[in-house]
Amino acid sequence: SIPWNLERITPPRYRADEYQPPDGGSLVEVYLLDTSIQSDHREIEGRVMVTDFENVPEEDGTRFHRQASKCDSHGTHLAGVVSGRDAGVAKGASMRSLRVLNCQGKGTVSGTLIGLEFIRKSQLVQPVGPLVVLLPLAGGYSRVLNAACQRLARAGVVLVTAAGNFRDDACLYSPASAPEVITVGATNAQDQPVTLGTLGTNFGRCVDLFAPGEDIIGASSDCSTCFVSQSGTSQAAAHVAGIAAMMLSAEPELTLAELRQRLIHFSAKDVINEAWFPEDQRVLTPNLVAALPPSTHENLYFQ
Amino acid sequence: GAMGQEDEDGDYEELVLALRSEEDGLAEAPEHGTTATFHRCAKDPWRLPGTYVVVLKEETHLSQSERTARRLQAQAARRGYLTKILHVFHGLLPGFLVKMSGDLLELALKLPHVDYIEEDSSVFAQ
């Protein structure tokens, strides 16, 4: 049966026993800045082009052993959530991956900047259709990273990022705090904010909306046909990147402001239990869970 | 041809630039009242001291970015410091990424075209 997260973002009209918008997101290219990925996994084969971009720090620890499946784990799962054949949101979207996170899931602001610059240069050299950039990462507040995101957004690129998994104000993190970026928090099957160990999803005025981010089934790099459940604001951001790809594929001329407005408009309102957030953040945190547009847009979104 | 040469001629190039700016009024030093600022990650364990993103003012051309980077290297070398330019940014933001001692920050902040400098820091998969 349909995974809970795909059911949650699907308008009631489409809730059959399967989720299959036939060509969702086919006009859009989604860039993923993350770990390396297993690009020939059955769930994503042919959908992800691995660019030659790589800018990662050395792994910590003298006894660290690079295990390919672990190195690829985070990125493979997210690529599957965005465009996977069976568990993906935008099954028609094509993706390009840039490696900015090492085998321990760690990167640098500078490496991310160089990655964003690479995307801009690629866009200038070979202009294609709409671009979505997924940044499933977070660091401390960074003026320069936010500035780079602003410039890329002004060049017509849609940037989607994880709010962060620190159970904290997203405005203290980047790129989550960049105003031009669509910042996504994580909710679970009960529409509760996601708890991750002692921490959980970030919140606050820098979050634009929430999306499913707990127990999300997606491609596992353990084997070419494996699936695994992962949780985090990265998974939530991947859902919104997929939804954005479908919206832009249906309406390629949408501006960032219009897309943001549509994402908010079609979200489920006031379903999140705000008691989870600190009292002073409740009024600042948007009570919105991302969803695809309803059946009135059938011809646009499910062509 | 001299403009294209790197480190060895850096001091000479600086001198030429200084003289030229005196002659034709080109303001190569920071304008009065616009002091470049330094930023670093508020979360100490995530800081990566020793690597800095030098962000230049918005309309700075690539050639000026390269020249500013070489100028920093030359001034640092004069003070006995080794520096390494890791990347020159253009396309999104003008600037460069430099590996250097934090002792040189004051010097770098005074370079022409500099808007701000940010110490590199870590980002993490979420």
Epitope: E18, Q20, P22, Q38, S39, D40, R42, E45, G46, V48, M49, V50, A68, R85, D86, K91, C223, S224, T225 | -
Partner: antibody, heavy 115, light 109 residues
Framework: QVQLVQSGAEVKKPGASVKVSCKAS????????ISWVRQAPGQGLEWMGW????????NYAQKVQGRVTMTTDTSTSTVYMELRSLRSDDTAVYYC????????WGQGTTVTVSS | QSALTQPASVSGSPGQSITISCTGT?????????VSWYQQHPGKPPKLMIY???NRPSGVSNRFSGSKSGNTASLTISGLQAEDEADYFC?????????FGGGTKLTVL
């Protein structure tokens, strides 16, 4: 254009081994693995397994597990399928195909097992 | 014994429409969006006609269409032409592998 070119026909004795090659071109190799499919005379298609062009990982069908080895040589963009302990019912046309989606096929390699 | 069940043969006259069924279980056809259909002429390798239940690769005529309901997938060929005479195979993902149907011989009368 996207192409898979296979090695020529083979005649083998029972108990022997055969190694069939498949050279890929015209697409980013790491974005797809290679599947191997065989077809006995007058019969249907049988999936034998898959190999990753990205990391060399394999996924073999239970029926041939233990007798088949798939390998890849990234320097020449060539994938190999070796079948050991051949029996007469291994007589078939062996195809390589791109990925699990099998959207592009090689021309086929006839392997005859006969004493 | 093939994992997916197809009729051994179907036939139709030029211009007619025919449908070939492919029945599996919830562990293959019913559980995945990845049902494919292949056309094979004698002595030739199979050619992909439909992928992911209902998508046509570029270059394949729009006379070919695919659908799925529950554990059964279907290939429909409309406006039958002489060159459509061939063997047709369906395939599906399973949890760890791939399975094919036994094949259907299409005769154009």
């Amino acid at each position: 254009q996207v192409q898979l070119v296979q090695s020529g026909a083979e005649v083998k004795k029972p108990g022997a081994s055969v190694k069939v090659s498949c050279k890929a071109s015209g697409y980013p190799l790491t974005s797809y693995g290679i599947s191997w499919v065989r077809q006995a005379p007058g019969q249907g298609l049988e999936w034998m397994g898959w190999i990753s062009a990205y990391n060399g990982n394999t996924n073999y069908a239970q029926k041939v597990q233990g007798r088949v080895t798939m390998t890849t040589d990234t320097s020449t963009s060539t994938v190999y399928m070796e079948l050991r302990s051949l029996r007469s019912d291994d007589t078939a046309v062996y195809y390589c195909a791109r990925g699990y989606g099998m959207d592009v096929w090689g021309q086929g390699t006839t392997v005859t097992v006969s004493s | 014994q093939s994992a997916l069940t197809q009729p051994a043969s179907v036939s139709g006259s030029p211009g007619q429409s025919i449908t070939i069924s492919c029945t599996g279980t919830s562990s293959d056809v019913g559980g995945y969006n990845s049902v494919s259909w292949y056309q094979q002429h004698p002595g030739k390798p199979p050619k992909l006609m439909i992928y992911e239940v209902s998508n046509r690769p570029s270059g394949v005529s729009n006379r070919f269409s695919g659908s799925k309901s529950g554990n059964t997938a279907s290939l429909t060929i409309s406006g039958l032409q002489a060159e459509d005479e061939a063997d047709y195979f369906c395939s599906s993902y399973t949890s760890t592998s791939m399975v094919f149907g036994g094949g259907t011989k299409l005769t154009v009368l």
